[in-house]
């Protein structure tokens, strides 16, 4: 138990903690006053974003455009960066005042809308140190954290949470499913100084836990004892042959026998056809391979379990969560089918503020976005039905014309004339 716990025990201290929003842990005691907003981007100033975001200098990379897409909740508020060219790499980044998350919570949040019904493409962000050359950001550029949805074919529909730990990108051991519909979704990553994390989609928790448990940052705490090996006489057989069981004397019968009912055909010529042999049939008395009865093995010791020892290589690291320097947020993606819109970027140290910001942005426009999409779908259905009706009408008309063309020409006569004609002929 930490001495801090003793230090902070006393009347009304919980209230003080609440009022001052103090968070404390065994390793760190820190005050969290006003939320620090390190980066926020909502694209509300028209083309202003072009001066804040830097593109990689490469002609064959895809272009981002400012758009709210084909459907939206609010045309202005829902404007974001949209990928606009199919089968392209995209590289765009924005810098901010460098900061360290040591001793404090880190929250990364943004919205993604795959309105193109994405088949293969990234929807994730990367947080880089400020040492990144933004004009040369690429797939191998070293980042601190990569977070967000990724879809590619039927096999990949996941939320990546990757930390660069001691120079190596370490993937989460859990499978977090991302949203794969056409609507805007809010993705949030929370990393806390007690080495815990939380992933939220649409402001609801989808995963949480400890960094040490859910990533392979550190060697395992326990390893198999290298000096231990299964004893020679360790018997893992649960059942053995009954030594008292023996094969019955009449057991061995051939599998096939000559058909006793078969007769040599009368026209069989031994000189021409060779010696006649009756066809063989399955022997009804054949019993197959004899196997002795199985009994419980009196020497059975169970499955040998390799004993484990403390791993001498293991030592805990209370600062897995911490990075000295965050300075750039980047979109470094590949998209087969373009159309994804990124918006409402936020990097802060305050979970409550992030949730509030999510509710005030994504939360406010999501219902109207769905409404507009539903309306468009309904209109499309109606148009499709109208087109189908028109097509059917045209087909019927064409069929009638064809029938008229095909049938032999008859003189047009009134019914009365035709009937009279019939009588006369009769």
């Amino acid at each position: 138990s930490s001495s801090l716990e003793v230090l902070f025990q006393g009347p009304g201290l919980n209230d003080i903690f609440e009022a001052q929003k103090i968070e404390w842990h065994e390793e760190n005691l820190y005050f969290q006053g006003e939320p620090a907003v390190y980066f926020k981007e909502q694209f509300l100033d028209g083309d202003g974003w072009t001066s804040r975001w830097i593109e990689k200098h490469k002609s064959d990379f895809g272009k981002f455009v400012l758009s709210s897409g084909k459907f939206y909740g609010d045309e202005e508020k829902d404007k974001g960066l949209q990928t606009s060219q199919d089968a392209r790499f995209y590289a765009l980044s924005a810098s901010f005042e460098p900061f360290s998350n040591k001793g404090q919570t880190l929250v990364v949040q943004f919205t993604v809308k795959h309105e193109q019904n994405i088949d293969c493409g990234g929807g994730y962000v990367k947080l880089f140190p400020n040492s990144l050359d933004q004009t040369d950001m690429h797939g191998d550029s070293e980042y601190n954290i990569m977070f967000g949805p990724d879809i590619c074919g039927p096999g990949t529909k996941k939320v990546h949470v990757i930390f660069n730990y001691k120079g190596k990108n370490v993937l989460i051991n859990k499978d977090i499913r991302c949203k794969d519909d056409e609507f805007t979704h809010l993705y949030t990553l929370i990393v806390r100084p007690d080495n815990t994390y939380e992933v939220k989609i649409d402001n609801s928790q989808v995963e949480s836990g400890s960094l040490e448990d859910d990533w392979d940052f550190l060697p395992p705490k326990k390893i198999k004892d290298p000096d231990a090996s299964k004893p020679e006489d360790w018997d893992e057989r649960a059942k053995i042959d009954d030594p008292t069981d023996s094969k019955p004397e009449d057991w061995d019968k051939p599998e096939h026998i000559p058909d006793p009912d078969a007769k040599k055909p009368e026209d069989w010529d031994e000189e021409m056809d060779g010696e006649w042999e009756p066809p063989v049939i399955q022997n009804p008395e054949y019993k197959g391979e004899w196997k002795p009865r199985q009994i419980d093995n009196p020497d059975y010791k169970g499955t040998w379990i390799h004993p484990e020892i403390d791993n001498p290589e293991y030592s805990p690291d209370p600062s897995i969560y911490a990075y000295d320097n965050f300075g750039v947020l980047g979109l470094d993606l590949w998209q087969v089918k373009s159309g994804t819109i990124f918006d409402n970027f936020l990097i802060t140290n305050d979970e409550a503020y992030a949730e509030e910001f999510g509710n005030e942005t994504w939360g406010v426009t999501k219902a109207a976005e769905k409404q507009m999409k539903d309306k468009q779908d309904e209109e499309q259905r109606t148009r499709r039905m109208m087109r189908t009706k028109m097509r059917m009408r045209r087909m019927r008309r064409t069929r009638r014309k064809m029938r008229r063309k095909m049938s032999p020409a008859r003189p047009r006569t009134s019914c009365r004339e035709a009937c009279l004609q019939g009588w006369t002929e009769a």
């Epitope: 089968a87 088949d119 074919g153």
Partner: antibody, heavy 127, light 107 residues
């Protein structure tokens, strides 16, 4: 799991080109990435390049840039490797190898290693 | 360009532990894969991402990676483990293989 079957052995003249095919079965072709690796007699493995069919783009080892073309035909689930301006040093066994896509970036393919290999195609370059 | 260095050969007595190393500048920051290749056959992936075993690969095969050296460890070596072993990494959008190590199981 995907299986990879390569085309048969080839004997080529110096200066000519060779095109080796690698047909995938037993999996969704677009969910895999294909690499081409060669091995000269008595030598080690050498990566030539790779393609992710769903991307439609290939990337190549610097050594082979301009001389190798890797393509994929999704309709027949077949990847191809064409090597031009052949010389005697190109005599080798050429392997295609695949790994399942785990994401939309190039690095995902290589992050998990190449877990399925073709049987190899022997290409002999001799005058 | 990035280089991986492997010893040309390693010998081990049956039942003992063989260790094959793969050296590279700060290799510990990269993901290392190991392949086994028997004469006349295609390579087989035995370890991916430093220490993960694909299904069907015996537990006797393990891997580690830190600093400037990655290691493939084969415990309780058997005659059937005799093969060439290659390490591999991904660096600067390129796949790099080590030169290979011939493992001989004595006896």
């Amino acid at each position: 799991e995907v299986q990879l079957v390569q085309s048969g052995a080839e004997v080529k003249k110096p200066g000519s080109s060779v095109k080796v095919s690698c047909k995938a079965s037993g999996g969704t072709f677009s969910s895999y990435a294909i690499s081409w690796v060669r091995q000269a007699p008595g030598q080690g493995l050498e990566w030539m390049g790779g393609i992710i069919p769903i991307f439609g783009t290939a990337n190549y080892a610097q050594k082979f840039q301009g001389r190798v073309t890797i393509t994929a035909d999704e309709s027949t689930s077949t990847a191809y490797m064409e090597l031009s301006s052949l010389r005697s040093e190109d005599t080798a066994v050429y392997y295609c190898a695949s790994s399942p896509l785990r994401g939309s970036g190039w690095y995902w393919h290589y992050y998990y290693g190449m877990d399925v290999w073709g049987q190899g195609t022997t290409v002999t370059v001799s005058s | 360009s990035y280089e991986l260095t492997q010893p040309p050969s390693v010998s081990v007595a049956p039942g003992k532990t063989a260790r094959i190393t793969c050296g590279g500048n700060k290799i510990g920051t990269k993901s290392v894969h190991w392949y086994q290749q028997k004469p006349g056959q295609a390579p087989v992936l035995v370890i991916y991402r430093d220490s993960n075993r694909p299904s069907g690969i015996p537990e006797r095969f393990s891997g580690s990676n830190s600093g400037n050296t990655a290691t493939l460890t084969i415990s309780r070596a058997q005659a059937g483990d005799e093969a060439d072993y290659y390490c591999q990494v991904w660096d600067s959008s390129t796949v790099v293989f080590g030169g290979g190590t011939k493992l001989t199981v004595l006896g």
